[in-house]
Interface confidence: medium
């Protein structure tokens, strides 16, 4: 019987998408490049379910992890790397007092049980996301 593998080896499947949790650390810009090199995108979160899933992955491993969110384009205006804005309903995920932009913190990370803004030149783990392969037929 032919087996279907919707995601590459070492990627995690969740609700139609594949996620790669890095084992090394890069700055935010280089994390974008790392995801692009494998045909993916630094993770853009589209639903509460996806957020809960990713936050759990990050907090379980006790890692500070980049996501594809920054206010580099305009200070205070948070935007995903696919160009979409951060919806008001997602602002609940910031940790208490965040984002605080202390010392030019323009890139978002998973930190503990929520999100934090931090300096984009810091090396952190990252999560890539791409659509899962279709297993129909």
């Amino acid at each position: 019987e032919r087996l279907c593998h919707p995601c590459p080896w070492e990627w995690t499947f969740f609700q139609g998408n594949c996620y790669f949790m890095s084992n090394s650390q890069r700055n935010w810009h280089d994390s974008i490049t790392a995801c692009q090199e494998v045909g993916a995108q630094l993770v853009v979160i589209k639903s509460a379910e996806e957020q809960n899933f990713l936050q759990l992955q990050s907090s379980r491993s006790n890692r500070f992890t980049w996501m594809g969110l920054s206010d580099l384009n305009h200070e205070g205006t948070w935007q995903w790397v696919d160009g979409s804005p951060l919806l008001p309903s997602f602002k609940q995920y910031w940790n208490k007092g965040e984002p605080n932009n202390v010392g030019e913190e323009d890139c978002a990370e998973f930190s503990g049980n929520g999100w934090n803004d931090d300096k984009c030149n810091l090396a952190k783990f990252w999560i890539c996301k791409k659509s899962a392969a279709s297993c129909s037929g």
């Epitope: 890069r26 700055n27 580099l72 030019e104 300096k119 030149n121």
Partner: antibody, heavy 119, light 112 residues
Framework: QVQLQESGPGLVKPSETLSLTCTVS????????WTWIRQPAGKGLEWIGR???????NYNPSLKNRVTMSVDTSKNQFSLRLNSVTAADTAMYYC?????????????WGQGTLVTVSS | DIVMTQSPLSLPVTPGEPASISCRSS???????????LDWYLQKPGQSPQLLIY???NRASGVPDRFSGSGSGTDFTLKISRVEAEDVGVYYC?????????FGQGTKLEIK
Amino acid sequence: QVQLQESGPGLVKPSETLSLTCTVSGGSISSYYWTWIRQPAGKGLEWIGRVFTSESTNYNPSLKNRVTMSVDTSKNQFSLRLNSVTAADTAMYYCARDRGTYLGGFDPWGQGTLVTVSS
Amino acid sequence: DIVMTQSPLSLPVTPGEPASISCRSSQSLLHSNGYNYLDWYLQKPGQSPQLLIYLGSNRASGVPDRFSGSGSGTDFTLKISRVEAEDVGVYYCIQALQTPFTFGQGTKLEIK
């Protein structure tokens, strides 16, 4: 509004090291790549390389063995060192902010500093 | 390295008339993320270059809407709908898909 200012000696002797500094004002150096580009008189532009942190750099292979870039976040400056210069390195040297893969483009640029290699 | 080729190298234009500059790359600049890593710059006489268009077709902040960028893959075009006297200078394309980033030779736009 971010502004960039190049500084360094305008005259360098052949075989010596060209050292330039770019000072960033009006914004933090922490969030972007920073790049160096040069232009010989009457000629086109050549990308020298870029730096994000001193451990994260990309250099033009045509210069790779001679070029070093670094960042000093405490001074909001980044620098270029080019070893073993010859007359072919005589050019206007520009520093610029590289907005990175996500935003794209070099913006803003410094006004440029002319470096002449001559004995 | 990716080679960038611009044409024409010289472009005399009457004010108020349109102008078009072509830029071709030796390999595709279209990334799987859908972006074309091609930017356009204008260097006015005696000045530093300034960003006009980034990621193929996005106008930089403060750039007049008479400037537009189009194309995908290996063929790109910068268009000026109505040339003004202040548009004179040398126009450069650059590929930012892979390092080393490489510029075209430049196109000198002058007023007839």
